[in-house]
């Protein structure tokens, strides 16, 4: 049928709560395109009737809620005037108990996120809620070890939990809970977050300067190898950590299994007044899921990102 197949990484989800996945891959979906969702190579598209438990909502597929039998490979077909892409998404539904629900704890968890707080600093955790505009979200409540978080050091601000003066005791199992309203019905979303504490990103009395990257996009072809340097100047006596992160996780940890994207070994050149540090990120093979995602270079309190972008089609 002339469609190019693109395979996404597996999504592991919890049963009994809402889930949504957006079929958007810039710049494929930036022009005039049609998006249609299918399940398990069925010829019949996913329903667009909003009353259906599983339905397509614009470019999204929406499960209200996700159920055991929903595991499988879903395809979204993106048709442009001169192109066709078929994105394959493998969804695995499982039952996960974060607290024992039989004793009045929290219900089943969705995605298990790993986030980091910096010791002694003011920092924040994020509740990742990805749903179409038709879903109204809130209010958000935060829990630690199954107890609702309260206290002067914690402030719920939109999707974040601000934590002031982070201490070692702040590590542990967190969850954010949101009420999702869709077509007059209410559902509960619960995301588990495993929080670790680091003291590595110390200020060191200096603010490092990231020379490159500069919060920009890089055009790169699908399937190619890409190496990007992060160049940082800092004082000679600094104690700052320099690293690459994606989704608030060290790239080496995030891609621990596939090792497809790795952080390089840091090198530095000494000048009289300062040091110039270089740490690179290597994409062994650029995949579709890498596009549109900010890959962040961190140097102490400084951050800068690159976003990979598909080259504009050449119609010559």
């Amino acid at each position: 049928d002339g469609c190019k197949d693109i395979f996404m990484k597996n999504e592991i989800l919890s049963a009994s709560q809402p889930f949504a996945f957006n079929c958007t891959f810039p710049p494929i979906t930036s022009g005039e395109v049609s998006v249609t969702w299918y399940k398990n190579s069925s010829k019949i598209p996913v329903s667009k009737i909003i009353q259906s438990r599983i339905h397509q909502d614009e470019t999204w597929i929406l499960f209200l809620p996700m159920e055991w039998g929903d595991s499988g490979v879903y395809q979204c077909v993106i048709k442009g005037r001169d192109s066709c892409h078929r994105i394959h998404v493998n969804l695995t539904v499982f039952e996960k108990h974060w607290c024992d629900t039989s004793i009045g704890g929290l219900p089943n968890l969705s995605d298990e996120y790993k986030q980091i707080l910096h010791l002694g600093k003011d920092d924040s955790l994020t509740c990742h809620l990805h749903f179409p505009k038709s879903c109204v979200l809130g209010p958000i409540k935060w829990y630690k070890d199954c107890n609702e978080i309260k206290g002067e050091r914690f402030t719920v601000l939109e999707t974040r939990l601000l934590v002031s003066n982070v201490s070692a005791e702040d590590r542990g199992n967190y969850a954010c809970q949101a009420i999702l309203t869709h077509s007059g019905k209410q559902y509960e979303v619960l995301n588990g977050i495993t929080v670790s504490i680091t003291e590595r990103a110390g200020y060191g009395g200096s603010v490092p300067k990231i020379i490159y990257p500069k919060n920009h996009s890089i055009e790169v072809q699908l399937g190619t190898t890409l190496i990007v340097d992060c160049n940082v100047t800092d004082t000679k006596d600094n104690t700052n950590l320099r690293c690459w992160r994606v989704n608030n996780t060290l790239v080496d940890d995030y891609y621990d299994e596939s090792k497809r994207i790795r952080e390089g070994v840091e090198t530095h050149v000494s000048f009289r007044e300062h040091n110039l540090y270089t740490v690179n990120i290597t994409f062994l093979e650029v995949k579709m899921e890498d596009y549109g995602l900010p890959f962040m270079c961190h140097a102490g309190v400084s951050t800068a990102y690159i976003i990979l972008q598909l080259p504009a089609p050449d119609f010559r």
Epitope: D122, L129, P139, T155, L162, V301
Partner: antibody, heavy 120, light 112 residues
Framework: QVQLVQSGAEVKKPGASVKVSCKAS????????MNWVRQAPRQGLEWMGM????????RLNQKFKDRVTMTRDTSTSTVYMELSSLRSEDTAVYYC?????????????WGQGTLVTVSS | DIVMTQTPLSLSVTPGQPASISCRSS???????????FYWYLQKPGQPPQLLIY???NLASGVPDRFSGSGSGTDFTLKISRVEAEDVGVYYC?????????FGGGTKVEIK
Amino acid sequence: QVQLVQSGAEVKKPGASVKVSCKASGYTFTNYYMNWVRQAPRQGLEWMGMFHPYGDVTRLNQKFKDRVTMTRDTSTSTVYMELSSLRSEDTAVYYCARTTSMIIGGFAYWGQGTLVTVSS
Amino acid sequence: DIVMTQTPLSLSVTPGQPASISCRSSKSLLHRNAITYFYWYLQKPGQPPQLLIYQMSNLASGVPDRFSGSGSGTDFTLKISRVEAEDVGVYYCAQNLELPLTFGGGTKVEIK
């Protein structure tokens, strides 16, 4: 639709206190922070703090921490902001404001403002 | 506290012409969750402020599409593609990355 209606203008003497009210309607009162922002004559905007009716959580700009108290009356969906030990530089329009949604920031809804004049 | 610095202080624009306002923050407002916690407001004479742009580049409800927001983590721009008479007022930038929330000093836009 969301509406925030504030109390009327006040004239106060230095050293006195003022209590400004903000009555909310058109949404679930206990789901949202109420923010307070002030604007001195021909000046910019200054965030004073925010108050969450669920759990009575107050977060203040340190500049006002000893002088501002925020309270609520859930039965009337009203939030109050009291500023004590008034001085002439507290002469300003005081606004209450609510965010766009529970997960998107930015103050999409504002009260009409309450002018507080501090003069001896 | 994060300091927000706006330029220019005032701007006089011919109707139908484009206009641009800049704002710089003393700290990057790009959070590691990839959201930029930056906002633009317009305060028309005698009115409370109104939200124009949220999270750096998203148009608030009811705002005409002649307004657009862009920027990096620290440098931001509000563009009006074709200024209309109703666009006069004081434009403020703001951040809510962290407490206290802070605003820029404002840019007054008037019609020539």
